[in-house]
Amino acid sequence: KLTIESTPFNVAEGKEVLLLVHNLPQHLFGYSWYKGERVDGNRQIIGYVIGTQQATPGPAYSGREIIYPNASLLIQNIIQNDTGFYTLHVIKSDLVNEEATGQFRVYPELPKPSISSNNSKPVEDKDAVAFTCEPETQDATYLWWVNNQSLPVSPRLQLSNGNRTLTLFNVTRNDTASYKCETQNPVSARRSDSVILNVLYGPDAPTISPLNTSYRSGENLNLSCHAASNPPAQYSWFVNGTFQQSTQELFIPNITVNNSGSYTCQAHNSDTGLNRTTVTTITVYAEPPKPFITSNNSNPVEDEDAVALTCEPEIQNTTYLWWVNNQSLPVSPRLQLSNDNRTLTLLSVTRNDVGPYECGIQNELSVDHSDPVILNVLYGPDDPTISPSYTYYRPGVNLSLSCHAASNPPAQYSWLIDGNIQQHTQELFISNITEKNSGLYTCQANNSASGHSRTTVKTITVSAELPKPSISSNNSKPVEDKDAVAFTCEPEAQNTTYLWWVNGQSLPVSPRLQLSNGNRTLTLFNVTRNDARAYVCGIQNSVSANRSDPVTLDVLYGPDTPIISPPDSSYLSGANLNLSCHSASNPSPQYSWRINGIPQQHTQVLFIAKITPNNNGTYACFVSNLATGRNNSIVKSITVSASGTSPGLSAGA
């Protein structure tokens, strides 16, 4: 299709543009260019006849146009009025017309912009500043840059006047930056010189450094004061309210106990007229003090609280050391030391974090140790454990149950039988029990500090006869050559012997069979399909014996390699082909057939009536077991011969 491409599309005044023609047909009579979106003889720029190679100017010809033999039109010394559409009209050799329209836009070259400001020294949190990008230019886009980055999103920044004005409301010190504006149109982009915004601010509350407040007698005291301020602040020092000097630093050599007191730094900003002060209390010790540990939390809760241990006092030029359980600190992501090593933070304390903890201050000759501190970590109660673990008792014996749950403070215990409260003790003792003492025995552990409670329930059966046991299994459908199965004989009973039978026989000797847990558990490793048998467990004591119902192990296996029957591979034309596929598998597999690789049907039997030599090929049976996730297949070649061509061929079904 005939198309016009304007190169460039956006043209600067005074430059030139080429209306480039694409897909110009062959065998032309000629072509004409028109100003506008249609063929209009009154707006013809120029015409060109191929045969005579003659160009004829039209009414819209300005003398700045050059037409090329490939029909492209060059317009030179572009003026604003040249903006718009141009139509090329092509007449082919057979006098068939074709036309295409292109367009371009004309823009002026932009001058270098500059920034004007309504406030050269705005005061922080008080003044607004409006920057305006000069000059105002038609059809130009205005952009702003702060430190050579595009404008950040902020409710204090507002663009107006077609983005030509940038207003900063309630200026802050962070607005002190290099500001540039840029003017753009499609043919040029110019950026202004940068304007630095000078925001007056402060002084902020001064900071006195170093931060430590404890000194030893004989040291030099060197305090420095700093307050963020523009212009820079003027500083004054006061000791116990008395003016000392107008300097940023205060130096007192060889201090004594008498130099203890309150030290005040005052910062003043002459432009904003503001004053701010900060006071620090300095203590001068005659001797290095014995350190001690303070804690921000004396009773932290396990897995909830963090604890910050701080070594006091704070002394200048001192090294702080820590020990836990009389060892140096272990490496742990839950242990964090502050930059000066004075504070040790334990994140998310556990019951194992009790300590003891010690800190030390190292001086020239020795290390002074604090007294040890032990953390009282509140935890628990954990799930209580009832011992012993027996659930069956004979009448006449004594029942003695003990309950324990890890807890700090120690748990308070309660016993319930069949939901009825019995006593608030850790141990429950009932002498000479009878069948009536059978029931649900609940131990409840309570932590008074955390308010948390946990319970454990145990079923106690008192009976002269042992109950009929049952078998529990950890895997009801194990996969052959992959899974293990553990059978457990329930219940657990006191003074009881556990026995096992497989298919009515005592256990065979096998490295894959293992008894454990007082013969109460039978484990079969790497099960096979031959393990799919009836398993029975038995319990017996001096007065009775009982056997469980059999449990048959359902082993999932296969599919094995399938067999296609009948085995014949040669058939006579006209016979019926009746192939049956079978594969050992549990559960039964899904069957499918493919003939020469083409899927056929999902049946176990493949039947084709009256076969011909066209039925020659490979017959594949595919089997899949969805339970084991395994697949298998077999391929059989079938040859069909025309009737009577070869002896010994199967007549088929």
Partner: antibody, heavy 121, light 106 residues
């Protein structure tokens, strides 16, 4: 001055043939496209055929395609229309016309006075 | 092929009248439309080309307009020599003419 003069018209029986000529003067014939337009008695104008300056490009109306042939001899400044298998409905005044050598959408700026062709038994 | 339909097929008017003849194409032909004037016994004469461009030597009372499918020839003030038959012609392929509009003296 541009002049176009047609000749060769006359009475012819259905199925017969006729050759029309158009002698051109007053312009550069060899670089001009030329065409034939006809007008049946009391009817409107019907474009018949056109030919490019070098005889390479020819076009015909469906009604005459396969029966009429347009040709030119640039050395003689003459345009021809060979009409075969003539029918009664071909009866008309046949005009020779020029396409100008400024590429406007195709138009016929100069016409001859026409020659009458009558097809009748 | 593209069909050209002129209306009206005939028209009576007086000297000094403003006359409008319309031509409709069966499909869009852009601006590829020419108007011709033919007087009895004479060859046609080109008036307007490219829908609206006046052929050199044609009086300015003749004007053309339209694009796509609908076109108009207007004679702003009829003169005695303007009574003739007017044809529109589409300059596509093939170059078919309208059936003509006969302009007569009232």
């Amino acid at each position: 001055e541009v002049q176009l003069l047609e000749s060769g018209g006359g009475l012819v029986q259905p199925g017969g043939s006729l050759r029309l000529s158009c002698a051109a003067s007053g312009f550069t014939f060899s670089s001009s496209y030329m065409g034939w337009v006809r007008q049946a008695p009391g009817k409107g104008l019907e474009w018949v055929s056109s030919i490019g300056s070098g005889s390479y490009s020819t076009s015909y109306a469906d009604s005459v395609k396969g029966r009429f042939t347009i040709s030119r001899d640039n050395s003689k400044n003459t345009l021809y229309l060979q009409m075969n298998s003539l029918r009664a409905e071909d009866t008309a005044v046949y005009y020779c016309a020029r396409y100008p050598s400024v590429p406007f959408p195709p138009l016929l700026d100069y016409w001859g006075q026409g020659t009458l062709v009558t097809v009748s038994s | 092929d593209i069909q050209m339909t002129q209306s009206p097929s005939s028209l009576s008017a007086s000297v000094g009248d403003r006359v409008t003849i319309t031509c409709r194409a069966s499909q869009s032909i852009s601006s590829y439309l020419n108007w011709y004037q033919q007087k009895p016994g004479k060859a046609p004469k080109l008036l307007i080309y490219a829908a609206s461009s006046l052929q050199s030597g044609v009086p300015s009372r003749f004007s053309g307009s339209g694009s796509g499918t609908d076109f108009t020839l207007t004679i702003s003030s009829l003169q005695p020599e303007d009574f003739a038959t007017y044809y529109c012609q589409q300059a596509g392929n093939p170059h078919t003419f309208g059936q003509g509009t006969k302009l007569e003296i009232k």
